[in-house]
């Protein structure tokens, strides 16, 4: 069975816990508890592949930006989310994947921008501000609510395809590289 | 190498109390204990109580929802499970869990690291 490492990052209060916890337990979580680390493995059917999630339920506080480095090294893939009610929160998530991809040593690490909060009226951050950000990267965007669960699936489902089209990539490459150095001067 | 140790276990009658803990000897985050499952003879273990690192987010098994309450002390990279009104059916083996937690069905149903377990007995 694949097993899939996926981080999800992002500014305090933006939802990251109440995201992961609606995928994984079905239910929302109200209270905000700032996270210091979580890390949870479901095992779910994508696209008719059966596959090992392995979340980590990252810090949002800047009390604990030194253990980024240690996590951004191990995923696969990650979750940028933001909350569409607070501006400096999308602002923030260019630093993240500035720091992802120094972290990572490479510019095009699976990514999916999240808007989360989307059942909140008090939006701050249009989506089209967002989607022009995603298509800067060239990674998706998806908004949700962990709320009413809105895009939850939709937004995890999706780095994992992310992840897996940059495995195919990867390996085309590695094949190319290997027919390259087979040929003849 | 990862290592649980469990204490406070016993022999108790219905309706008293036991604290059982568990300390972790290792000292990163992913490593710290996380909750309790349990096991009566005969049975399969089974999902008791979970709780985050920040110990703001807590799970309960039905069955002891009310009764018991986890919490942890990360200064002392500890565990706790309070158990009160103990009943007959509450004995069995009590294992402490840490680092990642696997889920289904919306419970936890495994952890990476166990440890060797304490026996709780409540007699009636």
């Known amino acids: 069975m694949t097993e899939y490492k996926l981080v999800v990052v992002g500014a305090g209060d933006v939802g990251k816990s109440a995201l992961t916890i609606q995928l994984i337990q079905n239910h929302f979580v109200d209270e905000y508890d700032p996270t210091i680390e979580d890390s949870y493995r479901k095992q779910v059917v994508i696209d008719g592949e059966t596959c090992l999630l392995d979340i980590l339920d990252t810090a949002g506080q800047e009390e604990y930006s030194a253990m980024r480095d240690q996590y951004m090294r191990t995923g696969e893939g990650f979750l940028c989310v933001f909350a569409i009610n607070n501006t400096k929160s999308f602002e923030d998530i260019h630093h993240y994947r500035e720091q992802i991809k120094r972290v990572k040593d490479s510019e095009d690490v699976p990514m999916v921008l999240v808007g989360n909060k989307c059942d909140l009226p008090s939006r701050t951050v249009d989506t089209k501000q967002a989607q022009d950000l995603a298509r800067s990267y060239g990674i998706p965007f998806i908004e949700t609510s962990a709320k009413t669960r809105q895009g939850v699936d939709d937004a995890f489902y999706t780095l994992v395809r992310e992840i897996r089209k940059h495995k195919e990539k990867m390996s085309k490459d590695g094949k190319k590289k290997k027919k390259k150095s087979k040929t003849k001067c | 190498d990862v290592q649980l140790q469990e204490s406070g276990g016993g022999l108790v009658q219905a309706g008293g109390s036991l604290r059982l803990s568990c300390v972790a000897s290792g000292r990163t985050f992913s490593t710290y204990p996380t909750g309790w499952f349990r096991q009566a003879p005969g049975k399969e273990r089974e999902f008791v109580a979970r709780?985050?690192?920040?110990?703001?987010?807590?799970n309960y098994a039905d069955s002891v929802k009310g009764r018991f309450t986890i919490s942890r002390d990360n200064a002392k990279n500890t565990v706790y499970l309070q158990m009160n009104s103990l009943k007959p059916e509450d004995t069995a083996v009590y294992y402490c869990?840490?680092?990642?937690?696997?889920?289904?069905?919306?419970?936890?149903?495994?952890?990476?690291?166990w440890g060797q377990g304490t026996q709780v007995t409540v007699s009636s």
């Open positions: 709780i985050n690192l920040s110990g703001g987010i807590t």
């Open positions: 869990g840490g680092g990642s937690t696997t889920w289904a069905g919306g419970i936890p149903t495994n952890f990476d690291y």
